[in-house]
C-alpha cells in the first residue's frame, strides 16, 4: 500500500501476492469527511491500473474484481473526481503476481583443492517474479549438519565455507537445496557424495621442462601437485597448432618424459590432475608453459640452382641460388651456408661460408669441369650437401622442351606448358622451370625463381613472386645426366596496354634509309609482356593516314631501319608498343628529312 494515505484506503483480497491466473478484489474507500465538499453523493471514485482507468463508482467506496494480471508488479491507484476540480489521488496498492518455485534441479557440489571449501550449484527453474530465498543444507556423518541461506534474487550458487578432509574419504555427505517464496516452497532431490567425489584438485603449478644434454630426445616435464593426486593428463602442442597431443599418466609424482617433440619448436604444455581413477573430476588445466625445444642438426638437402654467364673468351660467371630449408628440415636457426666449388680434374677446391644470403656469385675459368656443393649449418651441425655439376644447361638442342607456352591462370599465377624434347623423352630425369622479371638490360641482380618438375609432367603452375602487369622471362630446362636443353618464353599473369610508347632518341641517315633508335619503355609502364613495336610516319603537313612498320619485340633490340622515306620530304615519326591487351599511347614525335638524292 502507498504509505500514509490520508484520504482513504485501498484494500486487496485475498492477498497482495497472488499466483499467476488468480482473481483479486480491490476496494477503494474514502475516510470520513474526505469526499467532495457539500456534494458527498457526487463523489466519483475512479480506479486506475497504472495510468489506465478500469472502473469508477459514485459514492464512498468502490469494489472491483480484477483478473488476467501479468507476472510482476501491477500498481492500482484510486482517485476522487469532484465537479470543477482535478482528480486527486486517494490511495494505491501494488499486486505482486508470481509462481511458486520449481524444484531445483541438478544440484552438484565441489571442493576446489584439498584445502578449499564446499560449494554447490543448481538450476533454479523458471523465474518466480517474486523474492525467493534458497537454503542449502549439508548433512554428514555423526549427525553433523551445516546450513547456508542465499539472499540473492537469482541464487544458484552457495559456498558453505567448510572444508572436507581426507581422513575418511569414503564417508557420505548429503546436500539438499530448498527454495521458498510467498507462494510456496520446493526442495531438490538430495545429492549424496564422498570426499573423493567432490574434491576437484587445484591445477598443477610450477611447471618446468628440462632437456638433458640439450637434446630434444631427452626431455622431462616437471610440475607440482596437491598431495593426494593419483592421475595426471598432459597436453602439448606446437604454439602455431590448434591440435593437442594428449598423454594420461598414473602416479607420475610430478614428472614425465616426452619422447616425440620436434626440435627447435616452441611448444605449449598444460597439465591437469585427478585424485581417483573413476571418482571425482579433473582439475582445471594448469597455466601454460611455453618452451622452445633445442636444435638438432638439419635434415634434408638444399634445393640448389645456378646460372652461367659468359664474360670473355676465358672466364665465366657462375651465380648459385638455393632455397631455405623448411622449418622442419632446418631444425634450428641456420647460421650460415657452406659453398664448396671444386674443379673435378685438378682437385682444386674453394670453400666459403655465406651468411644472410641464399645466393653466391663467382667467376671461374671457362675450361675444366666444375662442381659445387652447398649445405646449411645450424648450431648442431650441417645438412647433407647438395652437389651439382656445372654444365651448359642449354647445350643439348635435342633435349630442348618443345612448344613452350605461358598463360595467365587467375590472379598472379602463370601456367607453363611444354612438350617433351624430340630426343628420347624417357631420357629426361627432371624438368626445371625458371622465371625472373624481364629487365631489358639483362640485369643479373634480378631475383631468380625456379621449381622442379617430375619427368612425366608437361606443365607447371608458377605463383611464387609473380606480380600483375610484369613480364617474366620463363625457361624450361630438361635435364638428363650431365646434359641439358632449354627453351624460353615470355609470360605474364595479367596485362593491359602499355602506359606509354617508346621514346625516339635518335634518327640517323644511312645510304638512303634511316635508322631509328629508341629508349625502352620503363618496366613499370610496360604493363605486361610487349609483343610488338610500331613505328608510324607521315608527311609533316599531310592529313593522310600515317604509314606504319610493325617490329616483333626482342629484349635487346632498340633500333630499326626504314627505307621507304622520300628524300627532301619532312616526316613526323613516332612509336607505340603493344601487349596482348592493346596498344600504348604515342611516344614522342620526331621530325626528319632525308637528304639523299631522289630516284
Amino acid at each position: 500500500k502507498i504509505d500514509a494515505c490520508k484520504r482513504g484506503d485501498v484494500t486487496v483480497k485475498p492477498s497482495h501476492v497472488i499466483l499467476l491466473g488468480s482473481t483479486v478484489n480491490i476496494t477503494c474507500s474514502l475516510k470520513p469527511r474526505q469526499g467532495c465538499f457539500h456534494y458527498s453523493r457526487r463523489n466519483k471514485l475512479i480506479l486506475y491500473k497504472f495510468d489506465r482507468r478500469i472502473n469508477f463508482h459514485h459514492g464512498h467506496s468502490l469494489n472491483s474484481q480484477v483478473t488476467g494480471l501479468p507476472l510482476g508488479t501491477t500498481l492500482f491507484v484510486c482517485k476522487l473526481a469532484c465537479i470543477n476540480s482535478d482528480e486527486i489521488q486517494i490511495c494505491g496498492a501494488e499486486i505482486f503476481v508470481g509462481v511458486a518455485p520449481e524444484q531445483p534441479q541438478n544440484l552438484s557440489c565441489i571442493q576446489k583443492g584439498e584445502q578449499g571449501t564446499v560449494a554447490c550449484t543448481w538450476e533454479r527453474g523458471r523465474d518466480t517474479h517474486l523474492y525467493t530465498e534458497y537454503t542449502l543444507q549439508l548433512s554428514g556423518p555423526k549427525n553433523l549438519t551445516w546450513q547456508k541461506q542465499c539472499k540473492d534474487i537469482y541464487c544458484d550458487y552457495l559456498d558453505f565455507g567448510i572444508n572436507l578432509t581426507p581422513e575418511s574419504p569414503e564417508s557420505n555427505f548429503t546436500a539438499k537445496v530448498t527454495a521458498v517464496n510467498s507462494l510456496g516452497s520446493s526442495s531438490s532431490l538430495p545429492s549424496t557424495f564422498t570426499f573423493l567425489d567432490i574434491v576437484r584438485p587445484l591445477p598443477p603449478w610450477d611447471i618446468r621442462i628440462k632437456f638433458q644434454k640439450a637434446s630434444v630426445s631427452r626431455c622431462t616435464l616437471y610440475w607440482r601437485d596437491e598431495g593426494l593426486v593419483l592421475l595426471n593428463r598432459l597436453r602439448y602442442r606446437p604454439s602455431n597448432s590448434r591440435l593437442w597431443n594428449m598423454v594420461n599418466v598414473t602416479k607420475a609424482k610430478g614428472r614425465h618424459d616426452l619422447l616425440d617433440l620436434k626440435p627447435f619448436t616452441e611448444y605449449e604444455f598444460q597439465i591437469s590432475s585427478k585424485l581417483h581413477l573413476y571418482k571425482g573430476s579433473w582439475s582445471d588445466w594448469s597455466e601454460s608453459l611455453r618452451a622452445q625445444t633445442p636444435e638438432e642438426e638439419p635434415t634434408g638437402m638444399l634445393d640448389v640452382w645456378y646460372m652461367k654467364r659468359h664474360i670473355d673468351y676465358s672466364r665465366q660467371q657462375i651465380s648459385l641460388f638455393w632455397k631455405n630449408l623448411s622449418v622442419s628440415e632446418a631444425r634450428g636457426k641456420i647460421l650460415h651456408y657452406q659453398v664448396t666449388l671444386q674443379e673435378l680434374t685438378g682437385g682444386k677446391a674453394m670453400t666459403q661460408n655465406i651468411t644472410g644470403h641464399t645466393s653466391w656469385t663467382t667467376v671461374i675459368p671457362r675450361t675444366g669441369n666444375w662442381a659445387v656443393a652447398v649445405s646449411a649449418a645450424n648450431s648442431k651441425g650441417s645438412s647433407l650437401p647438395t652437389r651439382i655439376n656445372i654444365m651448359n644447361l642449354c647445350e643439348a638442342g635435342l633435349l630442348a622442351p618443345r612448344q613452350v607456352s605461358a598463360n595467365s591462370e587467375g590472379m598472379d599465377n602463370i601456367l607453363v606448358t611444354w612438350q617433351p624434347p624430340r630426343k628420347d623423352p624417357s631420357a629426361v630425369q627432371e624438368y626445371v622451370v625458371e622465371w625472373r622479371e624481364l629487365h631489358p638490360g639483362g640485369d643479373t641482380q634480378v631475383p631468380l625463381n625456379w621449381l622442379r618438375s617430375r619427368p612425366y609432367n608437361v606443365s607447371a603452375l608458377i605463383s611464387e613472386n609473380i606480380k600483375s602487369y610484369i613480364c617474366y622471362e620463363i625457361r624450361v630446362y630438361a635435364l638428363s645426366g650431365d646434359q641439358g636443353g632449354c627453351s624460353s618464353i615470355l609470360g605474364n599473369s595479367k596485362h593491359k596496354a602499355p602506359l606509354s610508347g617508346p621514346h625516339i632518341n635518335a634518327i640517323t641517315e644511312e645510304k638512303g634509309s634511316i635508322l631509328i633508335s629508341w629508349n625502352s619503355i620503363p618496366v613499370q609502364e610496360q604493363m605486361g609482356c610487349l609483343l610488338h613495336y610500331r613505328i608510324y610516319w607521315k608527311e609533316r603537313d599531310s592529313n593522310s593516314q600515317p604509314q606504319l612498320c610493325e617490329i616483333p619485340y626482342r629484349v635487346s633490340q632498340n633500333s630499326h631501319p626504314i627505307n621507304s622515306l622520300q628524300p627532301r620530304v619532312t616526316y613526323v615519326l613516332w612509336m607505340t608498343a603493344l601487349t596482348a591487351a592493346g596498344e600504348s599511347s604515342h611516344g614522342n614525335e620526331r621530325e626528319f628529312c632525308l637528304q639523299g638524292k631522289a630516284n
Epitope: G72, T73, F96, I153
Partner: nanobody
Framework: QVQLQESGGGLVQPGGSLRLSCIAS????????MDWYRQAPGNQREWVAS???????YYDDSAKGRFTISRDNAKMTVYLQMNSLKPEDTAVYYC?????????WGQGTQVTVSS
C-alpha cells in the same frame, strides 16, 4: 537490505528541466518495478511514474507528456527527466521499490519551481 538514494533536485524556473536519479543497492532491483512519488507541502505522497523491469513506463496524468522515466539495470539506477516544469510540480520527489515484503523508499530530493 535495499537502500535508495535520490539526487538531481534543485531550484528551476518555470518551463525549465531537471533530471532526477535514484541509485539502488542490493540485488532485488532487477525483478521489481521502480516508482517515483512526490509530496508537496501539506499534501500526501502521490504517485508520479513507474517503470517495469523490462522498461515499460507508466505515468500519472499530471506527468504525461512532460516527464520521462527510464532505468539502467546494469547501474541499478532509475531516472526521471522532467521538462516544462510548473510551479505546481514543486515537491519532494521520492523513489520507491515495491516488494511483496514491503516498500523501500529513498530519502527524497527537493524540487522547487519558481521564478
Amino acid at each position: 537490505q535495499v537502500q535508495l538514494q535520490e539526487s538531481g533536485g534543485g531550484l528551476v524556473q518555470p518551463g525549465g528541466s531537471l533530471r532526477l536519479s535514484c541509485i539502488a543497492s542490493g540485488s532485488i532491483f532487477s525483478i521489481y518495478n521502480m516508482d517515483w512519488y512526490r509530496q508537496a507541502p501539506g499534501n500526501q505522497r502521490e504517485w508520479v511514474a513507474s517503470i517495469t523491469p523490462s522498461g515499460d513506463p507508466y505515468y500519472d496524468d499530471s506527468a504525461k507528456g512532460r516527464f520521462t522515466i527510464s532505468r539502467d539495470n546494469a547501474k541499478m539506477t532509475v531516472y526521471l527527466q522532467m521538462n516544462s516544469l510548473k510551479p505546481e510540480d514543486t515537491a519532494v520527489y521520492y523513489c520507491k521499490v515495491p516488494t511483496e515484503k514491503g516498500n523501500y523508499w529513498g530519502q527524497g530530493t527537493q524540487v522547487t519551481v519558481s521564478s
